[in-house]
């Protein structure tokens, strides 16, 4: 199901309501309702690089205003690590790397930088997006997707990999971020929360959405993923927020209806090909973009993130199915599978539209708009 085109003048987090602007003041969660909902502090509140935490160790932050909410350790995801912690964990990922990147979890040991040193890098993902601080960049043209409408056969592999539900995509799905910035899609997966607890990875002005879809792409400049890891622009991810709406989303239902079959960690099923672009918002022209990292080990940097301004609507039942069907390691539910937001450390988030022009209800004081770095020129 494709979404209607968004209102032209309402950036995500701006002043009007509706699926394209879910962040009106009335939607702000209260601290006691959802203590995790606004865990990312503002960039200025974050510690310096030397204080950067391991993935699951939280940054020490200054007390926040009541409106911002507070970060609580007990609200972090606690999916257990696979296997007995006493057992040997020396099986190198793919037998070629020093770190065992198969042994990691959300919300506990081992610290992710021990799994992969890149996880302690300065330019990590996800981040908190502040539309008011985004740099309007007219050079960011509408995204181009080609070959995303797949025929029913051959079928696609849908797997519960213990960290997410992942749909492996076939060759031939081409995406362009702009002239000469061409990619091919590899896979898509989702991040979600738990009952009454949102689980998107990126946040907007501290607001966490119910869920988030990621479509991971490899630059056509590289033949293999391992060649692209850590190279600027080697990988690109399209991300969209999933929100609750009144109707069932028929595109997502093609996947969600099969989750029961892969409830067990490591299980997989085959699903008919579908229109992958129907899982994304319909407006490919309005988005935020920045350079970050993979949000799970190996946390490789140089990843171009494109976060749609428009959201995708799923029914309450569908969001419940997503967050309440799958099981992860150690007989624990696969829930809250998102990484805490990471400091920008001087990075500027760019917007393909004038996101900072519209005054948000929560803009208490004038802000200095960042200048566009002319990405894609």
């Amino acid at each position: 199901q494709r979404l209607p085109r968004m209102q032209e003048d309402s950036p995500l987090g701006g002043g009007s309501s509706g699926e394209d602007d879910p962040l009106g003041e009335e939607d702000l969660p209260s601290e006691e309702d959802s203590p995790r909902e606004e865990d990312p502090p503002g960039e200025e509140d974050l510690p310096g690089e030397e204080d950067l935490p391991g993935e699951e160790d939280l940054p020490e932050v200054k007390p926040k205003s009541e409106e911002e909410g507070s970060l609580k350790l007990e609200d972090l995801p606690t999916v257990e690590a696979p296997g007995d912690p006493q057992e040997p964990q020396n099986n190198a990922h793919r037998d070629k790397e020093g770190d065992d990147q198969s042994h990691w979890r959300y919300g506990g040991d081992p610290p992710w930088p021990r799994v992969s040193p890149a996880c302690a890098g300065r330019f990590q993902s996800p981040v908190d997006i502040r539309p008011q601080l985004a740099a309007f960049c007219p050079a960011l043209r509408p995204l181009e997707l080609l070959g995303f409408q797949l025929p029913p056969l051959p079928e696609l592999r849908l797997r519960n990999n213990g960290h997410s539900v992942q749909l492996t995509l076939p060759p031939g799905l081409e995406m362009a971020l702009g002239p000469g910035r061409e990619y091919r899609a590899l896979q898509l997966h989702l991040h979600w929360g738990a009952a009454g607890r949102p689980g998107s990875e990126h946040t907007v002005e501290g607001h966490r959405f119910p869920a988030e879809i990621h479509v991971v792409h490899l630059s056509t400049a590289f033949a293999r993923v391992d060649e692209a890891l850590g190279r600027p622009g080697g990988l690109a991810v399209l991300a969209a927020f999933l929100e609750e709406g009144p109707e069932e989303n028929s595109a997502y239902e093609q996947l969600l209806s099969r989750l029961e079959e892969i409830a067990e960690e490591g299980s997989e099923t085959q699903v008919p090909g579908l229109d992958i672009s129907a899982l994304l918002p319909s407006d490919f022209s309005r988005y935020f973009q920045y350079e970050g990292s993979l949000t799970t080990p190996p946390c490789a940097q140089g990843v171009i993130w494109t976060v749609f301004n428009q959201t995708v609507m799923l029914s309450a039942k569908q969001l419940h199915t997503l967050s309440d069907t799958l099981w992860g390691p150690g007989d624990s539910r696969l829930q809250l599978n998102f990484r805490a937001t990471q400091p920008l450390n001087g990075r500027v988030i760019e917007a393909s539209f004038p996101a900072g022009v519209d005054s948000s209800p929560r803009a208490a004081e004038p802000v200095q708009l960042n200048s566009c770095l002319a990405a894609g020129d």
């Epitope: 007995d84 964990q89 793919r94 042994h103 056969l153 051959p154 993923v225 490591g266 299980s267």
Partner: antibody, heavy 125, light 107 residues
């Protein structure tokens, strides 16, 4: 370097259950993304995939053998096992264990990148 | 089940020859195909994955091509150690299935 080693009786009587074990050394069977397979090869013939198991216990069997096959895993011993019931002479084969890795980033299977050396099982009275 | 048909079932060639083995899938398997080499009394060894990616440590004289239903393994210059049986494997959908094999013999 991960290595696989099959073990079990080389001779099984018809109608009985064939039992084989594959021991994984040089790495943990519980590593995420790794699937552990059984494959067989009839004398002078081609290869037939029997099924896989994940450390969580999740399995997938070849439908042609599903009614007779059970694959199990013992993470404490770093082993996985094959049981094939009601065997006949047609089950005489070399049985191999092999590993598949699903890359978390691509979702693509690295199919049968490592194999055991195989063990010959004869079904005969 | 997806049927994998290899041809020829056997061939005779000399050292230095260029050898081509074909594998046909009964339905579209995209590039979800691997090639394996097996010598007598030994376990198979993977040569090619994803239809055309050479396994590390495998001589560059081996190459794979194709996608959809038609796939080819080529040995550009046959070496004495290349005399063996070659199998294709589809891992597009379960049950994963192998071709029946191609035996490459010395002429």
């Amino acid at each position: 370097q991960v290595q696989l080693q099959e073990s079990g009786p080389g001779l099984v009587k018809p109608s009985q259950t064939l039992s084989l074990t594959c021991t994984v050394s040089g790495g943990s069977i519980s590593s995420g993304g790794y699937y552990w397979n059984w494959i067989r090869q009839h004398p002078g013939k081609g290869l037939e995939w029997i099924g896989y198991i994940y450390y969580s216990g999740s399995t997938y069997y070849n439908p042609s053998l599903k009614s007779r096959v059970t694959i199990s895993v013992d993470t404490s011993k770093n082993q996985f096992s094959l049981k094939l019931s009601s065997v006949t002479a047609a089950d005489t084969a070399v049985y191999y264990c092999a590993r598949t890795y699903y890359d978390i980033l691509t979702g693509y299977p690295d199919a049968f990148d490592i194999w055991g050396q195989g063990t010959m099982v004869t079904v005969s009275s | 089940d997806i049927q994998m048909t290899q041809s020829p079932s056997s061939l005779s060639a000399s050292v230095g020859d260029r050898v081509t083995i074909t594998c046909r899938a009964s339905q579209d398997i995209r590039n979800d195909l691997g090639w394996y080499q097996q010598k007598p009394g030994k376990a198979p060894k993977r040569l090619i994955c994803a239809a055309s990616s050479l396994q590390s440590g495998v001589p560059s004289s081996f190459s794979g091509s194709g996608s959809g239903t038609e796939f080819t393994l080529t040995i550009s210059s046959l070496q004495p150690e290349d005399f063996a049986t070659y199998y294709c494997l589809q891992h597009n959908s379960y049950p994963w299935t192998f071709g029946q094999g191609t035996k490459v013999e010395i002429k």
